[in-house]
């Protein structure tokens, strides 16, 4: 276990700080210029550091179980959870699903009645007594409701001519009835005979298009629970056609723009506003079908078969039947499917925050395991055999009170889980006793709370009137730092700098600012190692011996000796056991300076006074000519000719000697002087 | 305001010791590093010891100890076996919030 602590001073931004993390409540555990957040750390720390076992602050997430009894039947328990979560802490508990035999179902047969689907009407129309005998045979409750659709009522999904709008079918001696986007016709019933008897008023319609509105229906099935009749039991939604269906968006091909809303909108069992609503898309519609437990059964013809296949890849608890040409086998196709539906388990919950995380191991009775997946999946599912599955929920931050339903779709029945912060540290401080605290404040797990006007580890600071503010003034550099560089504590407007973990680093200075670890590196050491410096406030300082920014070299000036012995002929200094030139001079030694002025001009005067003792220096040539000496022998350097204060020319010789602006000079002995005009 | 101030120089013969002090206003010197340069003529500031308030400390030379006492607020240049090449003016020089600050210095000339 890590604890990854940010500023931390008290024990409950310790344990938010991480699963990791605990608190140490020892008192006087911190020593001084130690801050409050070292009594945050991992368990074994803390132990190593000192501090008791039973003054460790550490609490956990936990999860307590509550059957309701009371009640008929249950499919899933527990039917209560309550939570207390830890940051980063994951709770889990388990949640065990027996599939109960004979469970309610009412089932809604949703029916495509474009024109097409003529034969397959005059089937249905027979069926009620078959579809009623079927669900007794695995419930004994059943009910079964009827609807229909085609689709909106607007170019180009049907024909808006008038004669077209009166009868859309392509044979004039058909009775046919004005097409309709979706018309509730039965509500859910257990009477066989009113089923036959309504059905057996409808009449075949059609549009225009291949798609049909089937998704516009599904949306006012799912969202009008007391007009279809829905109960709350198993709910069963079979879906049958032999084509496509429009989806979101394919409104704008009719001029409809505002999307669909997801509410009923049922005005005498029609769908009458379908002209002013897009058709839902896909995941709106998944969702409204979860959110009330209805399970679809899509009964289509084998060539619409995968195209429904893709659609129940993403409503789950969905499944496809091949239905004849004429629906003749839609009975058989209900038993299976729901046989299918009612065999797979998927174990969700409703939306949450994005502070809280829930996974799902599925222990399924076929000794499959499917570990922290997004929700719980079972598949074979046998009646009265418990499947289990283990559900964990971690908070990411210190949550407040909240509840959410755990579900198995398409089942009525739910597990509430309440869900609590587990934030709080229930510290032991013996008393009251604000002795601890120079009677300024009370002691909360371990620290000292002091009362206003009082700071410090003990309350041993009075503010005086000046704000904190002021205070802490005193402990920033500018007002764009932090206080005492985020490494000390400002006690009384003083910066109390902390002790570090880390071995050697000492910190220090008025802000905090300094240490003893932060210099230049040699050989991966600090200023190369204790053997050859030290490292104050970011800058080496060597022993002797050494030199350099990280004391890398040693003190020998051996690189730097002309062959007179002189350090970088006295035209620069010693560096590493290499010449740092002054400006101009050229590597390894000083001696050359190929960009300088020439030096002839400078020292005419002195030419003229140390030989002939004349010129401006004459009386002074000694005090103005300091760094020249005169030869009596003729000197290798840089030859020069200028003209005295006479207007005489002058040769002299300079020899470069050690040091800035120190010549040998050798002077003619005879000057040229020109004769002026008589 | 930060101030610094030098004494105990003077004029010791080779082979001599000497005792600088540097003293400063408030508890500063037990809070921070305090460094000794020296200048002597013609040539640049050079640095001669340095001393952490928790009390590690270093020097160029080992003929030179730095010492502080925190109850006076006073850092020591202990200099013994004075050569006259030691000849210069010595500085304390401290860095406290940020700035640097210098003392106005004290002469240590080693001359027979």
């Known amino acids: 276990q890590e604890c990854t602590k940010f500023k931390v001073s008290s024990c409950r931004e310790c344990i938010e700080s991480g699963p990791g993390c605990t608190w140490c409540q020892k008192l006087n555990f911190t020593g001084p210029g130690d801050p409050d957040s070292i009594r945050c750390d991992t368990r074994p720390q803390l132990l190593m550091r000192g501090c008791a076992a039973d003054d460790i602050m550490d609490p956990t997430s936990l999860a307590e179980t509550q059957e309701d009894h009371n009640g008929g039947q249950k499919q899933l328990s527990p039917q209560k959870v309550t939570l207390y979560l830890r940051p980063g802490q994951a709770a889990a508990f388990n949640v065990t699903f027996r599939r109960a035999k004979g469970y309610p179902i009412d089932l809604y047969y949703l029916m495509d009645l474009s024109y097409s689907m003529l034969d397959d009407l005059r089937n249905v129309k027979k069926l009620g007594g078959d579809l009623l005998r079927a669900l007794n045979e695995i419930t004994e409750s059943g009910r079964i409701g009827f609807g229909s659709f085609v689709d909106k009522t607007v170019l180009p999904f049907v024909n808006t001519h008038p004669d077209k709008l009166r009868n859309p079918c392509p044979n004039k001696e058909k009775e046919c009835q004005p097409p309709f986007a979706f018309r509730h016709v039965l509500k859910l019933t257990n009477n066989s005979n009113q089923f036959q008897t309504e059905v057996g008023k409808q009449l075949i319609s059609g549009n225009l298009d291949a798609p049909e509105g089937g998704l516009d229906a599904m949306m006012q099935v799912a969202a009008c629970p007391e007009e279809i009749g829905w109960r709350n039991v198993t709910r069963l939604l079979v879906f049958a056609t032999d084509d496509g269906f429009h989806f979101a968006g394919d409104g704008k091909l009719g001029a409809i723009l505002t999307p669909n809303d997801g509410r009923c909108h049922l005005e005498d069992n029609l769908y009458k506003r379908s002209n002013e609503f897009d058709y839902p898309s896909v995941g709106q519609l998944a969702h409204k079908l979860a959110e009330n437990n209805i399970q679809p059964i899509f009964a289509v013809t084998s060539r619409m078969v995968k195209t429904y296949e893709k659609l129940t890849e993403i409503i789950p608890k969905s499944a496809v039947g091949e239905l004849s040409e004429d629906s003749s086998n839609v009975v058989h196709l209900i038993k299976n499917a729901y046989n299918k539906l009612s065999s797979r388990v998927f174990l969700d919950h409703n939306a949450l925050p994005d502070t809280l995380k829930v996974t799902y191991d599925s222990f399924c009775s076929n000794g499959v395991t499917h570990r922290n997946q997004p929700r719980g999946d079972c598949d074979g599912v046998q009646i009265n055999v418990p499947i289990t599955f283990q559900v964990k929920v971690t908070a990411t931050e210190c949550i407040q009170e909240q509840s959410f339903v755990i579900r198995a779709l398409g089942f009525t029945d739910i597990v509430t889980v309440q869900v609590l912060p587990q934030c709080e540290c229930r510290c032991r401080d013996q008393s009251r006793d604000r002795s601890l605290c120079h009677g300024k404040g009370f002691l909360e797990c371990g620290i000292c709370r002091c009362d206003t006007g009082y700071i410090g580890k003990n309350c041993e600071c009075q503010t005086q009137g000046r704000s904190s503010q002021e205070l802490e003034g005193s402990c920033r550099k500018d007002n764009n730092s932090i206080i005492c560089s985020g490494l000390g504590d400002c006690v009384c407007g003083q910066c109390l700098c902390h002790t570090s973990d880390v071995p050697g680093k000492l910190i220090y200075g008025q802000y905090c600012e300094c240490d003893t670890i932060n210099c230049e590196r040699y050989n991966g050491q600090v200023c190369g190692g204790p053997g050859r410096g030290l490292c104050f406030c970011g800058k080496c300082r060597c022993h002797p011996g050494f030199e350099g920014s990280a004391c890398q070299c040693e003190r020998t000036t051996e690189g730097c000796l002309n062959p007179r012995r002189v350090e970088c002929s006295g035209r620069g200094r010693c560096r590493c056991n290499v010449c740092e030139c002054h400006s101009g001079y050229q590597l390894p030694l000083c001696q050359e300076c190929p960009g300088c002025p020439s030096p002839c001009g400078k020292y005419i005067s002195c030419a003229e006074c140390l030989k002939f003792e004349k010129g401006p220096f004459g009386k002074n040539c000694s005090a103005a000519c300091p760094g020249l000496q005169l030869s009596n022998n003729p000197v290798k350097g840089r030859t020069c000719k200028e003209r005295d204060s006479e207007g005489c020319w002058v040769a002299y010789t300079l020899e470069q000697q050690d040091g800035m602006d120190r010549y040998l000079i050798y002077v003619d002995e005879s000057r040229e002087c020109v004769a002026g005009p008589n | 305001e930060v101030q610094l101030v030098e004494s105990g120089g003077g004029l010791v013969q080779p082979g001599g010791s000497l005792r600088l002090s540097c003293a400063a206003s408030g508890s500063i010197l037990s809070r921070t590093d305090v460094d000794w340069y020296r200048q002597a003529p013609g040539k640049g500031r050079e640095w001669v010891a340095i001393?952490?308030?928790?009390g590690t400390t270093n020097s160029r030379d080992s003929r030179f100890t730095i010492s502080r006492d925190n109850a006076k607020n006073i850092v020591y240049l202990q200099m013994n076996s004075l050569e006259p090449e030691d000849t210069a003016v010595y500085y304390c020089r401290i860095y406290w919030g940020g700035n640097v600050y210098w003392g106005q210095g004290t002469q240590v000339t080693v001359s027979s």
């Open positions: 001393i952490a308030p928790f």
